[in-house]
């Protein structure tokens, strides 16, 4: 019964970019300006997203797809579909409630977003520090001593087998 009704429903013939207009005997009417329908059989069109203020338009709204926003220079997207814009900081800084603050000693941030992370402790892996860390860059750990001894093989060991669906690092 449900299937029969859907086949007889004139609204199911309305393509994306239109809506089924109840006020006009269920005729398929084009979406009004600044609205869209991304699927067929819609009884209303959705209002287009407007990229205002710190948001800027990455993709214009069309009758079949919503507008897409990104952030103005000096800001970066957060959240699904760029639902928020967050202020950029410089490398070597992190964003706090009081604004951008330099990374504390022993931490770094090599991006304009995100938080300061601790320098790698090379000795935990039996390695030594080749280059000291900075606010903008992690330390560089050298190879393990075994890799440096006479007769150490230059051949890179094969990567361990990975389960299907796992991407390499």
């Amino acid at each position: 019964f449900e299937r029969t009704r859907s086949l007889q429903d004139p609204c199911s013939n309305c393509p994306a970019g239109t809506f089924c207009d109840n006020n006009r005997n269920q005729i398929c009417s084009p979406c009004p300006p600044n609205s869209f329908s991304s699927a067929g059989g819609q009884r209303t069109c959705d209002i287009c997203r407007q990229c205002k203020g710190v948001f800027r338009t990455r993709k214009e709204c069309s009758s079949t797809s919503n507008a897409e926003c990104d952030c103005t220079p000096g800001f970066h997207c957060l959240g699904a579909g760029c639902s928020m814009c967050e202020q950029d900081c410089k490398q070597g800084q992190e964003l706090t409630k009081k604004g951008c603050k330099d990374c504390c000693f022993g931490t770094f941030n090599d991006q304009k977003r995100g938080i300061c992370r601790p320098w790698t402790n090379c000795s935990l892996d039996g390695k030594s520090v080749l280059v000291n860390g900075t606010k903008e860059r992690d330390v560089v750990c050298g190879p393990s001593p075994a890799d440096l001894s006479p007769g150490a093989s230059s051949v890179t060991p094969p990567a361990p087998a990975r389960e299907p669906g796992h991407s390499p690092q």
Epitope: T120, C122, L130, V139, V140, C141, Q169
Partner: nanobody, 116 residues
């Protein structure tokens, strides 16, 4: 892990020059540093030069002012320009990709021989 292939080694007279090149099979940008090491027969492998992702460089004292390391992240290559070569520079030169969180990736090495 990337695969690394070196080229440019060979026999050269003292005072001459060579340019070694290291080609990586994948992106080198995410590595903490790219480096050249060398190993003479019976000796420990030693760091010659390294370059970090932000292009900070470090050189062994014995090669400062003579060797220059550079990288091209678009081509995934690391070069070592070697000038004023000395007999004591004779060794197998190996490219390395240094990643703090994993084992070092090594190339197979290329022989450099400096005759007097």
């Amino acid at each position: 892990q990337v695969q690394l292939v070196e080229s440019g080694g060979g026999l050269v007279q003292a005072g001459g020059s060579l340019r070694l090149s290291c080609a990586a099979s994948g992106s080198i940008f995410s590595y903490n540093a790219m480096a050249w090491y060398r190993q003479a027969p019976g000796k420990q492998r030693e760091l010659v030069a390294l370059i970090t992702s932000d292009r900070t460089t470090k050189y062994a004292d014995s090669v400062k002012g003579r060797f220059t390391i550079s990288r091209d992240d678009t081509k995934n290559t690391v070069d070592l320009e070697m000038n004023s070569l000395k007999p004591e520079d004779t060794a197998v030169y190996t490219c390395a990709a240094l990643l703090n969180s994993a084992r070092t990736s090594w190339g197979q090495g290329t022989q450099v021989t400096v005759s007097s």
